[in-house]
C-alpha cells in the first residue's frame, strides 16, 4: 500500500467479515480489507474483515509476518474473499497446532 495521506472522502470497500468482531454480519465496509492468521493457545485462528480507520490499516498492513501472526491486506470490493493469510514457515512446521476458524 502506498504511504499516502487519507482523502477527505476516502473510498470505502466491501469486505468479507469472519470472526468475533463481525457480530452476526458476514461483511463490513472500510478503507482496506484484510485476512489474518494467528496462533492462539495452539490453534490457528483465521479472521477476515475491514480496517475501518486509515492509520490502523497503514500500521498493521506494514507489519511483516511473524511465526505467530500474519496479516494480508488489499483494497477493492470483496478483495479478501479468496485470500488466506499464511504464516512464514522457513522450512519449519509448528507442532501441536490445529486449524480453527472464528465464525
Amino acid at each position: 500500500m502506498e504511504d499516502e495521506k487519507p482523502k477527505v472522502n476516502p473510498k470505502l470497500y466491501m469486505c468479507v467479515c469472519e470472526g468475533l468482531s463481525c457480530g452476526n454480519e458476514d461483511h463490513c465496509e472500510g478503507q482496506q480489507c484484510f485476512s489474518s492468521l494467528s496462533i492462539n493457545d495452539g490453534f490457528h485462528v483465521y479472521q477476515k474483515g475491514c480496517f475501518q480507520v486509515y492509520e490502523q490499516g497503514k500500521m498493521t498492513c506494514k507489519t511483516p509476518p511473524s511465526p505467530g501472526q500474519a496479516v494480508e491486506c488489499c483494497q477493492g470490493d470483496w478483495c479478501n474473499r479468496n485470500i488466506t493469510a499464511q504464516l512464514p514457515t522457513k522450512g519449519k512446521s509448528f507442532p501441536g497446532t490445529q486449524n480453527f476458524h472464528l465464525e
Epitope: K11, Y13, E25, H27, C28, E29, G30, Q52, R81
Partner: antibody
Amino acid sequence: QVKLLQSGAALVKPGDSIRMSCKASGYTFTDYIIHWVKQSHGKSLEWIGYINPYSGGTNYNEKFKSKATLTVDKSSSTAYMEFCRLTSEDSAIYYCVRRGHDGTGFDYWGQGVMVTVSS
Amino acid sequence: DVVMTQTPVSLPVSLGGQASISCRSSQSLVHSNGETYLHWYLQKPGQSPQLLIYRVSNRFSGVPDRFSGSGSGTDFTLKLSRVEPEDLGDYYCLQSTHLPLTFGSGTKLEIK
C-alpha cells in the same frame, strides 16, 4: 444497465404465504447485498432484512424475523422473499433493493410488488 | 432501534423557490469506521424511491446540484434550491449505521 425486476402483484388470503422474486441484471449478482423494504399504503418505509447472495448470509429486522425468509438462486441471479401467515397488516408494496458499494446506500430499487391480503 | 424524526411532514413550495428538510436521529449515526451513513431518497408519485444523497452530503450520479445534504452526528438537512416540477414527491431519510436500518417518516414536497 442495472435492473431489479420483481414479480407481479398478488392477492392472497389471510393465513396464506407468498413468495416474491427479484431478478437482477446488469451487474455481478454475488457482488452486491440485496435488501428488502416494506411500504404500507400511504406510510413510510420499513427495512425487512438483507441477504448476501455470495454467502447466503442473512440479517433480519427483529420485527420480521418470524414473518420473512430471504433466499437467493445464484444460477438465475434471483433473490426471493417468502412471507408467511399473512394478515391484513402485511398488505403493502415490497421492494428489493441493491446496496451499493462505497457507502452509497440503496442505489437501485425494484419496481415493487403490491401484495393485498383479503378474504 | 434508532428513531429518525423527519420534519416537516408537508412542505409547500413555489417553483423556483427553496426547500429545506430536517432529519434528526435518536442517537449518533457515526459508524465505528468514522463514516456517517445517512442517506436521502425521493419517491415520485407512483414510482420506487430513488437515491439522491448518500453519506450525508454526496450526490448520487445523475442527481442535479440543486440538491445538497449537510449535517453531522444526529442532525441532518436536505436542501433544494430552484425547485422544479420533477422534484415533487415524498422525501425520506435513511440511516444505515445501526441495525435495524430505519427511515424517517417522510416529507411531502408540494406546490404552494
